[in-house]
């Protein structure tokens, strides 16, 4: 994670002004995966490469954002750039985030992740939800998901909404939530680990 954001930025910054304009126009009509919204036209057209990179990551997350960017570049006839973007993205995807133990391979991996095992307790007991959202924003939460969780009136309903997105997460995404929990409410994590 995170590697893709750098790769998208390098790709977009390497477009001329004319190419960037063309990229934005194509982005308005490119087919999107189900469940993903389109960046509003007004905002999109005024963005520079750096803002557009961050918008792509917040709307589509890193992996799909990079894939989408590569598709548009390919559609523009920039096959080499698209290939370089995908190569750069995959080059960094093998490493687990620092400080997070890479999960054992599937045969040895326990069936449930910590956050799934303790879902009910986390919904009931997490109080620092805003902090978690900031830690996960743009990495595993899209802009829309972030806003949806924040809109909930209580901490338990916020956590319930957050958990509604976790079925689509992989082990590393769940590790990021666990790491954020360790940093914001370590006593709670320790208590649950002992239980």
């Amino acid at each position: 994670m995170g590697r893709a954001r750098d790769a998208i930025l390098d790709a977009l910054e390497n477009l001329t002004a004319e190419e960037l304009k063309k990229f934005k126009l194509k982005l308005l009509s490119v087919p999107l995966r189900e469940g993903y919204g389109r960046i509003p036209r007004g905002a999109l057209l005024s963005m520079d490469a750096l803002d557009l990179t961050d918008k792509l990551v917040s709307f589509y997350l890193e992996t799909y954002g990079a894939e989408l960017t590569a598709n548009v570049l390919r559609d523009m006839g920039l096959q080499e750039m698209a290939g370089q973007l995908q190569a750069a993205t995959h080059q960094g995807s093998g490493a687990a985030p620092a400080g997070i133990q890479a999960p054992p391979q599937s045969a040895a991996k326990p069936g449930l992740h910590f956050i799934d095992q303790h879902r009910a307790a986390l919904i009931a007991r997490v109080t620092n939800v805003e902090w978690l959202l900031d830690a996960l924003y743009g990495k595993v939460l899209t802009d829309e998901q972030y806003q949806a969780v924040r809109a909930e009136p209580t901490n338990p309903s916020k956590m319930r909404k957050l958990f509604s997105f976790t079925p689509a997460w992989n082990w590393t995404c769940k590790d990021l939530l666990l790491q954020a929990l360790r940093e914001s409410q370590s006593y709670l994590v320790e208590d649950l680990e002992r239980s």
Partner: antibody, heavy 112, light 106 residues
Framework: QVQLQQSGAELARPGASVKLSCKAS????????ISWVKQRTGQGLEWIGK????????YYDEKFKGKATLTADKPSTTAYMELRSLTSEDSAVYFC?????WGQGTTLTVSS | QIVLTQSPVIMSASPGEKVTITCSAS?????MYWFQQKPGTSPKFWIY???NLASGVPARFSGSGSGTSYSLTISRMEAEDAATYYC?????????FGGGTKLEIK
């Protein structure tokens, strides 16, 4: 393996200009932006600016606008930084860097 | 521009000790990058995108944080970790570095 080979040490007079080079090999030159970083003896790192060789897009820290000019030559896969109106404050080691890799640095000494 | 403030500026740690270096940003950034530099050498790319170790970096290093507060942690200090560490933000131009933290071995 990406490599950035920087030009040798430079000695220049106050008021003069100097052009430092950074030759890239081991990757597609136009894939990444190339940043330039200044480090005075015993001091920290200062980001000067960045150039994207394919598009020619450049970004500078305001502090270095008018002092540094970044260019890139695609055929020779070399990035350049020209520093003008040199003063003793410009004496430093200058590094070029891509996303993950750094050159060995070029020492610039400005002295009369 | 975004100003990064590192603390402490200088510190020493004994072998086996846990070390934490912090980097505070004047406004929110999406990721933090860390570099290690030893005297007379070029900086080395150390941690990217807040929490990912660059190739060849020992697993005792970790990175974390979000918003305006980030940190680099060494779980057990070793002699070879003595160096100066710099944080860098790439969220807004101009990209900026922290002032550095010099880590010495006791």
């Amino acid at each position: 393996q990406v490599q950035l080979q920087q030009s040798g040490a430079e000695l220049a007079r106050p008021g003069a200009s100097v052009k430092l080079s950074c030759k890239a090999s081991g990757h597609t030159f136009t894939s990444y932006g190339i940043s330039w970083v200044k480090q005075r003896t015993g001091q920290g790192l200062e980001w000067i600016g960045k150039i994207y060789p394919r598009s020619g897009n450049t970004y500078y820290d305001e502090k270095f606008k008018g002092k540094a000019t970044l260019t890139a030559d695609k055929p020779s896969t070399t990035a350049y930084m020209e520093l003008r109106s040199l003063t003793s404050e410009d004496s430093a080691v200058y590094f070029c860097a891509t996303r993950d890799y750094w050159g060995q640095g070029t020492t610039l000494t400005v002295s009369s | 521009q975004i100003v990064l403030t590192q603390s402490p500026v200088i510190m020493s740690a004994s072998p086996g000790e846990k070390v934490t270096i912090t980097c505070s940003a004047s406004s929110s950034v999406s990721y933090m990058y860390w570099f290690q530099q030893k005297p007379g050498t070029s900086p080395k790319f150390w941690i990217y995108s807040t929490s990912n170790l660059a190739s060849g970096v020992p697993a005792r290093f970790s990175g974390s944080g979000s918003g305006t507060s980030y940190s680099l942690t060494i779980s057990r200090m070793e002699a070879e970790d003595a160096a100066t560490y710099y944080c860098q933000q790439r969220s807004r131009y101009p990209w900026t570095f922290g002032g550095g933290t010099k880590l010495e071995i006791k």
